[in-house]
């Protein structure tokens, strides 16, 4: 939905650097098919995590570990010739500032890994 | 840090559903390895598309769209065998309500693909 | 068939120490990778620190590394991981792991409590 040319775009130097927000999610039922159950049929399977701080919103966030270093072959063993590396995203969160039972929030940006992925290896070859 | 034991956490019933929110952000310059190369070294490789939306807070998320039905061998070549799926994760986005140059947001939650593994498909044995 | 025997598990308080020790049945000269894996109580086994068959030697992530460090005795053929400035989290059962002609090899495991 195009903006008012006029308004100022979140983002922009100018925006108000304090703004309301209602925590009525909308969207809340999001058909959340995430991952399902790709972290164990994966060839680079993951196990989730439970990363759980009060202070922030949302407060339980799941972080993916890769199980093996390598990916797992048709024969259900690791090989080495590949990796299981983590794809991490940048999300938002609202953390309580200042902390203990306040209203205020400030956004903060987090580095999570959501889950993993096979890669060819980066080989470096010696002069 | 743990909370004072009489607060509400934020995702509680009788938390406020308005807050104040700074939108400074902590954390800007995240070490963002973000999948690094991982999209064109993946044997489940991906494109990254732009979504944009002034209205929403960010304005900017990348989407990744798998770039085959199957997974890349170590030939190169594309196996059927296996299937490439999108990783998808919720995330917490801030959406402007009502529209146009106001500073109240709403959360909105958003499902986006982060990027995509590599799994052994689910076989249906037809009776 | 290769056997892999751990020891050296126990319970400990948090910010303290533990070696844990892996006997090896076969030469872990000829492995393609040892190590560790661990599986945290209502997860699957995931792993902790590798060393390939180049010598690399490889950790998980950033909270194991710099904590823990794994070393292979090829005379003495076992392999040993030592946990320092332990946590909680690292609550696990530690199995022993090998890789032999293709072949993926776990220890029976032995558990690690950490006490907070």
């Known amino acids: 939905s195009p903006q008012n040319p006029g308004c100022p775009n979140a983002e922009d130097k100018n925006f108000p650097r304090t703004v309301m927000v209602n925590l009525n999610i909308r969207n809340r039922n999001t058909n959340s098919k995430r991952a399902s159950d790709y972290y164990n049929r994966s060839s680079s399977p993951w196990n989730l995590h439970r990363n759980e701080d009060p202070e922030r919103y949302p407060s339980v966030i799941w972080e993916a570990k890769c199980r093996h270093l390598g990916c797992v072959d048709a024969d259900g063993n690791v090989d080495y010739h590949m990796n299981s590396v983590p794809i991490q995203q940048e999300i938002l969160v609202l953390r309580r500032e200042p902390r203990h039972c306040t209203n205020s929030f400030r956004l903060e940006k987090m580095l999570v890994s959501v889950g993993c992925t096979c890669v060819t290896p980066i080989v470096r070859h010696v002069a | 840090s743990p909370q004072n034991p009489g607060c509400p956490n934020a995702e509680d019933k009788n938390f406020p559903r308005t807050v104040m929110v700074n939108l400074n952000i902590r954390n800007r310059n995240t070490n963002s390895k973000r999948a690094s190369d991982y999209y064109n070294r993946s044997s489940s490789p991906w494109n990254l598309h732009r979504n944009e939306d002034p209205e929403r807070y960010p304005s900017v998320i990348w989407e990744a769209k798998c770039r085959h039905l199957g997974c890349v061998d170590a030939d190169g070549n594309v196996d059927y065998h296996m299937n490439s799926v999108p990783i998808q994760q919720e995330i917490l986005v801030l959406r402007r309500e009502p529209r146009h140059c106001t500073n109240s947001f709403r959360l909105e939650k958003m499902l986006v693909s982060v990027g995509c593994t590599c799994v052994t498909p689910i076989v249906r044995h037809v009776a | 068939e290769v056997q892999l025997v751990e020891s050296g598990g126990g319970l400990v308080q948090a910010g303290g120490s533990l070696r844990l020790s892996c006997a090896a049945s076969?030469?872990?000269?000829?492995?393609?990778?040892v190590g560790w894996y661990r599986q945290p109580p209502g997860l699957q086994r995931e792993w902790v620190a590798i060393?390939?068959?180049?010598?690399?030697?490889?950790y998980a992530d950033s909270s194991v590394k710099g904590r823990f460090t794994v070393s292979v005795d090829k005379v003495k053929n076992t392999v040993t991981l030592q946990m320092n400035s332990l946590k909680p989290e690292d609550t696990a059962v530690y199995y022993c792991y090998a890789q032999w002609m293709g072949r993926d090899y776990w220890g029976q495991g032995t558990q690690v409590t950490v006490s907070s």
């Open positions: 076969d030469s872990v000269f000829t492995a393609k990778a």
């Open positions: 060393i390939t068959s180049g010598g690399k030697t490889n």
